[in-house]
Interface confidence: medium
């Protein structure tokens, strides 16, 4: 996955901005072998979103899209 | 003071196309996103599809998908819902509404006046 | 898609009295990201675009009378008109507002007894 703050199929950094909820599509977790752990969220337009797992607001984000893949 | 203002009534025959406009003013118009509900003459209210002004991002209900598209101009503050080929089924009146400013999905905030389509040969 | 169904279609009330409205969906609608329940309540008076009176599941929008309150969780939702006025005769929808498409229900219209 390319786009904010990804490279490779690592991440790189994590994004600072609010995650835009209504634009995302799914989500996965980076690889082990990554040096840095990372969820990315995949927006409706392909955009990849490089997220700390261990922020709040990113598990909340991650069980929503749970709840709307099992909907 | 927040309006959405919509077209005024139109009549139609069968296989005519048509495009209908809601104009948003009285806040930022590409911070919300805009959606279009059909009532039916004595029905209730059926949720078609919402659009994000911001950059045309679009999302119908499976049970619209295809039978309409809808747009947005974000110069003129204007949201649209249009028809290549109209049916006499799709006589009813049709509302804008403004999408609420939640992070998640929202209730409808705001309401345009309505727009009365009538299809009839 | 969310199924919601209303109950009753029509509810006729004396002047004053309480009117109940319930509004059940086929599946829950606890956003898992705000933990609130995602459930609208409208009023569409005749001649009228619907008006928000009541989001997620029990907050009143701005300038709608206190007489409006909205309760439940999961997928059982009621609205309550605790003293019925004239100018509350409508047809009342729920709309769920946790996934796309944000479905109504068919409508409960409230008339005086």
């Known amino acids: 996955a390319r786009g904010t703050n990804v490279g490779r199929e690592c991440c790189l950094e994590y994004f600072k901005g609010a995650i835009p909820l209504r634009k995302l599509k799914t989500w996965y977790q980076t690889s082990e072998d990554c040096s840095r752990d990372a969820i990315v969220f995949v927006t409706v337009q392909g955009r990849a979103i490089c997220s700390d797992p261990n922020n709040k607001r990113v598990k909340n984000a991650v069980k929503y899209l749970q709840s709307l893949e099992r909907s | 003071e927040v309006q959405l203002v919509q077209s005024g009534a139109e009549v139609k025959k069968p296989g005519e196309s048509l495009k209908i406009s809601c104009k948003g003013s009285?806040?930022?118009?590409?911070?919300?996103?805009i959606g279009w509900v059909r009532q039916m003459p004595g029905k209730g209210l059926e949720w078609m599809g919402i659009?994000?002004?911001?950059?045309?991002?679009?999302r119908y209900s499976p049970s619209f998908q295809g039978q309409v598209t809808i747009s947005a101009d974000k110069s003129i503050s204007t949201a649209y819902l249009q028809w290549s080929s109209l049916k006499a089924s799709d006589t009813a009146m049709y509302y804008c509404?403004?999408?609420?400013?939640?992070?998640?999905?929202?209730?409808?905030?705001?309401w345009g006046q309505g727009t009365l389509v009538t299809v009839s040969s | 898609d969310i199924v919601m169904t209303q109950s009753p279609d029509s509810l006729a009330v004396s002047l004053g009295e309480r009117a109940t409205i319930n509004c059940k969906s086929s599946q829950s609608v606890l956003n898992s990201f705000t933990n609130n329940n995602a459930l609208a309540w409208y009023q569409q008076k005749p001649g009228q675009p619907p008006k928000l009176l009541i989001y997620e599941a029990s907050t009143r929008e701005s300038g709608v009378p206190d007489r409006f309150s909205g309760s439940g969780s999961g997928t059982d939702f009621t609205l309550t008109i605790s003293s019925l006025q004239a100018e509350d005769v409508a047809v009342y929808y729920c709309?769920?507002?946790?996934?796309?498409?944000?479905?109504f229900g068919q409508g409960t219209k409230v008339e005086i007894k």
């Open positions: 709309q769920q507002t946790n996934s796309i498409p944000l479905t």
């Open positions: 009285g806040y930022s118009f590409t911070s919300y996103w």
């Open positions: 509404a403004r999408v609420g400013p939640a992070d998640v999905w929202d209730s409808f905030d705001y």
């Open positions: 659009i994000d002004p911001s950059d045309s991002d679009t």
